[in-house]
């Protein structure tokens, strides 16, 4: 789970060790702040929980790509 170190910065200290299907993911944001110990991706899940993931992992990259495409595709 991400930790807020102050009102403006949220950091991840541990990553999930289990892949989550993209069907269970709603959105994501990247953590690149120099105030944080590591770069991370925070996924917001369909049940509004935030989960820290390692951006180097393929499933994380694939999930971000999928969510990007979803956002770009207009709902008809």
């Amino acid at each position: 789970q991400p930790d807020a170190i102050n009102a403006a910065v949220t950091c991840c200290y541990n990553f999930t060790n289990r892949k989550i299907s993209v069907q269970r993911l709603a959105s994501y944001r990247r953590i690149t702040s120099s105030k944080c110990p590591k770069e991370a991706v925070i996924f917001k899940t369909i049940v509004a929980k935030e989960i820290c993931a390692d951006p180097k992992q393929k499933w994380v990259q694939d999930s971000m790509d999928h969510l990007d495409k979803q956002t770009q595709t207009p709902k008809t």
Partner: antibody
Framework: QVQLVQSGAEVKKPGSSVKVSCKAS????????ISWVRQAPGQGLEWMGG????????NYAQKFQGRVTITADESTSTAYMELSSLRSEDTAVYYC????????????WGQGTLVTVSS | EIVLTQSPATLSLSPGERATLSCRAS???????LAWYQQKPGQAPRLLIY???DRAEGVPARFSGSGSGTDFTLTISSLEPEDFAVYYC??????????FGQGTKVEIK
């Protein structure tokens, strides 16, 4: 340790309804769902449907659509399964089971509730 | 709906032997979202394996799962007396549509 405790055995007449409860303790209800699975005597497991309490909506197997209603009360950490228009083929043990909504495997199960439908 | 077909229906083996149970899906099971359960008479099922190959907490190392796509296997490396039971596979790709296989009974030969 998570525990799911179900209501007791029921004997029902054909055409009536039954409502089975499942109370969860020892864990959060927040990002979890409850599935209902039944098992007729000598038969396999059959998924009936499930609910994720924070969604306030349930999903049902096509076979039970229109005859089953699954609900959950977050304030009491209790899920309910109501089956209507009972027939003898509905005689079975009904289980509730918990799953993490991020995944789906059923990690904790209730003890089961025997529902007997007989005239 | 994804249909899971388990084989064989019954497996007759002796303690100490290796058991290999199969579960075949009618469609690709993405993310290997497949679990295995053990059920003994008069008891609720117990989770053994999730995500096709990960052992649940407290499950002995003699149980292992493998497979991906449409073909999955549960292996019990050396049967103990308490392993004689019915085993079910379960797919959970879609939260709105879970399905189980019909079960494989592992009985004493």
């Amino acid at each position: 340790q998570v525990q799911l405790v179900q209501s007791g055995a029921e004997v029902k007449k054909p055409g009536s309804s039954v409502k089975v409860s499942c109370k969860a303790s020892g864990g959060t209800f927040s990002h979890y769902g409850i599935s209902w699975v039944r098992q007729a005597p000598g038969q396999g497991l059959e998924w009936m449907g499930g609910v994720i309490p924070i969604f306030h909506t349930a999903n049902y197997a096509q076979k039970f659509q229109g005859r089953v209603t699954i609900t959950a009360d977050e304030s009491t950490s209790t899920a309910y399964m109501e089956l209507s228009s009972l027939r003898s083929e509905d005689t079975a043990v009904y289980y509730c089971a918990r799953y993490d909504a991020h995944y789906g495997e059923l990690d904790f199960w209730g003890q089961g509730t025997l529902v007997t439908v007989s005239s | 709906e994804i249909v899971l077909t388990q084989s064989p229906a019954t497996l007759s083996l002796s303690p100490g032997e290796r058991a290999t149970l199969s579960c075949r899906a009618s469609q690709h099971v993405s993310d290997a979202y497949l679990a295995w359960y053990q059920q003994k008479p008069g008891q609720a099922p117990r989770l053994l394996i999730y995500d096709a190959s990960d052992r649940a907490e407290g499950v002995p190392a003699r149980f292992s799962g493998s497979g991906s796509g449409t073909d999955f296997t549960l292996t019990i490396s050396s049967l103990e007396p308490e392993d004689f039971a019915v085993y079910y596979c379960h797919q959970y790709i879609h939260l709105h549509s879970f399905t189980f296989g019909q079960g494989t009974k592992v009985e004493i030969k």
